[in-house]
């Protein structure tokens, strides 16, 4: 069961896996959650009754029964991992710790104006896990305003000590705030021969890349496929690093694949969730249980529901045996990966889906869409909402996109003349406007946040957030869309769609059924040529056919320009303005969302 509260002055006895140092019990709980085996933890706070060398220790623990005996101990704080919980989990930690020095390898020292600047530097440095900043009140003159970037093998400090007039904190890479490039390519027939920090077994290069992404020291990887000539190295995933942060040595070698950590894109692609099944593949590991199951899907469910299960192998039933049920082997290992992978034995293997909640909800695959046609089908664009005003009468005002369980992203120009959020209603999971009746449930709007530099759509900053009064429960028909990663600025999107209930021609009416149109992106240079009287800035993005004919129109404003990249949908643009609708050589102009990711995160993550 899920226990979120912390137990003060309580220590769990036994079950120790490893000890790390964390600046708070709250962060110790996060570290425990992300550790492959940790189910419980005991943290020691600073206290006069405790030996200072034990302050800030976070002891990660495991137990077959999922609990351990409790002992009273002053300054000890204990709790359970969030593995047992169903809610979204994030490693993002924006806290700044005053008068704490988090020890690690100090590999970079520079002057910074503030702790915030130091944290930004850490976030944009490929090696940095955390930092310590000496404030201007620091006693030693030559160390004042010094920003020390640090890293360790585990990503957590090697020790934490009290030190006056310094502050420490963590990199915000896991908050999607890094400007580092996001390189998603996997390079076939390539070995990176740089330093190995670890090696694990993986069924394919994608899983290897995802393991690299959530390993604190891994910057890139090499994977040896099951056709690799050296049998003892098949399915081996080498996690690698280098001083420069890039591979220094690329060697052509058939049956090997290499790629990069997706740390800078982890908010828009799954990195923890290995959802595929591997046929004719057996995963070896410590056996947790053997259960009868009807199918490999049922076996995966059993593994997901067993909190200690990390992966499984299902052996289908022999004909007419055991009521058609096969054997489901639930397994675990010290690092969450199989200890060996064997092929040709007829098993079907896979991983627990428990870790999927550590990924952003927006990365969940949605059902296949209908190709062709202009009318959408239910669940095709589950992030699309219809924003209604109730004054003077109720009507569709604008589109919008779900980007979080309490947040809608839309256009600022939608709120011209809107005096209060009280007159707004957000309807999600809607296909036809005619579904909206008096008793249709909606989300009230608590707050409208308009970009403070917004004046008019044509001059940019046409972006607004709606904070909902209640949270959205994600389902197949209402779920969030991913924001583009800042590291993805150079991605060329080729599969982009605009959706909305807006007019189908300039003089028309709001459509009943949600419409969709596939529209190619247009370069800003090309777009500027089409709008000589306007300034097309880098904060805008354009889309449209040269010959016209397909475009967003009145009523689509605020809705999404959704682009699919690597199987995940991204909110690339917000429908903003254009000259007429679908006119020849007049592309639609959209707010370029990637340029506002910091603004969005600042507003939505504000405490």
């Amino acid at each position: 069961e899920c226990v979120t509260q912390l137990l003060k002055d309580t220590c769990f006895e036994g079950g120790d896996i490893t000890t790390v140092f964390t600046p708070s019990a709250k962060y110790c709980q996060v570290v425990c959650t992300y550790h492959p085996r940790c189910l419980l933890f005991t943290f020691t706070a600073e206290s006069p009754s405790e030996d200072p060398t034990r302050w800030f220790t976070c002891v990660l623990k495991d137990s077959v029964t999922e609990t351990l005996p409790r002992v009273n101990r002053t300054a000890a704080i204990s709790g359970y991992s969030f593995k047992q919980c169903s809610h979204q989990i994030s490693a993002c930690n924006k806290d700044i710790y005053v008068d704490l020095d988090m020890k690690g390898i100090n590999y970079n020292s520079s002057v910074a104006k503030s702790a915030q600047e130091c944290q930004e530097r850490c976030t944009d440095d490929v090696h940095c896990h955390f930092f310590t900043y000496a404030t201007r009140q620091f006693p030693s003159l030559e160390h004042r305003n010094i920003c020390l970037l640090k890293h360790t093998q585990t990503g957590t400090p090697t020790r934490i000590t009290k030190l006056d007039k310094v502050v420490s904190g963590f990199s915000l890479k896991s908050c999607a705030l890094s400007n580092l490039a996001c390189i998603r390519d996997i390079f076939p027939n390539t070995v990176f021969a740089d330093s190995n920090i670890d090696s694990v077994m993986a069924p394919d290069a994608f899983v290897c890349g995802r393991i690299c992404t959530h390993h604190p020291g891994c910057l890139f990887f090499t994977f040896f496929s099951q056709e690799w000539p050296k049998e003892s190295q098949r399915n081996l995933c080498l996690l690698k690093t280098s001083e420069s942060g890039l591979p220094s040595t690329r060697i052509k070698k058939s049956k090997a694949l290499s790629g990069f950590s997706l740390q800078s894109c982890r908010h828009s692609i799954p990195v923890f969730c290995h959802s595929s099944f591997y046929h004719d593949t057996d995963f070896l590991g410590e056996e947790l249980d053997i259960v009868a199951a009807k199918s490999h899907e049922a076996c995966q469910k059993l593994c997901t529901n067993a909190v200690r299960c990390q992966f499984f192998t299902y052996t289908p039933a022999q004909a007419s045996c055991n009521e058609g049920k096969g054997k489901c082997y639930l397994k675990l290992s010290s690092n969450g990966s199989p200890t060996k992978i064997l092929h040709g034995r007829g098993g079907i293997s896979g991983y627990t889906l428990r870790l999927c909640k550590m990924d952003n909800e927006c990365t969940t695959k949605i059902k296949p869409r209908i190709v062709g046609g202009t009318a959408s089908v239910r669940g095709e664009w589950p992030w699309q909402v219809t924003l209604h005003t109730t004054s003077p009468t109720q009507r569709h005002l604008c589109g919008g996109s779900i980007i979080g369980n309490q947040w809608i992203l839309t256009a600022a120009h939608c709120f011209y003349g809107v005096e209060s959020p009280k007159i707004l209603r957000v309807y999600s999971g809607i296909l036809n406007q005619s579904e909206i009746k008096e008793d249709t449930s909606f989300f009230g709007v608590q707050e409208i946040i308009i970009h403070d530099q917004y004046k008019m759509a044509e001059s940019g900053y046409d972006i607004a957030l709606l904070k909902l009064e209640t949270t959205v429960n994600y389902t197949d028909s209402q779920r969030p869309i991913c924001l583009p990663s800042k590291g993805d600025r150079n991605v060329i999107y080729t599969d982009c769609w605009v959706t909305g209930w807006g007019y189908r021609k300039l003089r028309d009416k709001i459509q009943n059924t949600l419409q969709k149109a596939k529209i190619p992106l247009v370069t800003n240079e090309e777009c500027q040529k089409r709008y000589r009287g306007h300034k097309i800035t880098h904060k805008m993005i354009c889309a449209g056919y040269r010959e016209g004919g397909k475009d967003a129109c009145k009523g689509d404003s605020g809705g999404p320009l959704s682009c699919k990249h690597n199987e995940v949908w991204h909110l690339v643009g917000i429908t903003s303005w254009g000259e007429g609708c679908a006119q020849r050589e007049r592309p639609g102009v959209y707010t370029n969302v990637v340029e506002y990711v910091d603004w969005i995160l600042e507003k939505t993550q504000a405490v």
Partner: nanobody
């Protein structure tokens, strides 16, 4: 038990030459990727040169044009011909089999299926 044994190290003046050999026992070169690594005091282990099972070769930029890797499958031996040696080439040289990169910057720890020799010292004086 797989064993790799290096030989041919020694002291030499800058501009001089040395030829390192690596002989394998309980192990055949035919289907293996062989390499020379080196580690200077206080430095990380670095890849010097590789010869892959399909005959492809790789050289670190610092040794290109001066070092040549080769192997004699019949003798189960790999060689590194080092010409025009420089003081910065001073290091312990390690022979490795199926070892793509060092572990934690150290020329001794391997992952499954990878092997290291004991190393041979090369000292180049100016």
């Amino acid at each position: 038990q797989v064993q790799l044994q290096e030989s041919g190290g020694g002291s030499v003046q800058a501009g001089g030459s040395l030829r390192l050999s690596c002989t394998a026992s309980e192990f055949t070169f035919d289907d293996s990727d062989m390499a020379w690594y080196r580690q200077a005091p206080g430095n990380e282990c670095e890849l010097v040169s590789t010869i892959t099972s399909d005959g492809g070769t790789y050289y670190a930029d610092s040794v290109k044009g001066r070092f040549t890797i080769s192997q004699d499958n019949a003798k189960n031996t790999m060689y590194l011909q080092m010409n025009n040696l420089k003081p910065e080439d001073t290091a312990v040289y390690y022979c490795a089999a199926d070892q793509w990169g060092s572990a934690e910057g150290d020329c001794t720890s391997s992952y499954p299926g990878g092997y290291w020799g004991q190393g041979t010292q090369v000292t180049v004086s100016s």
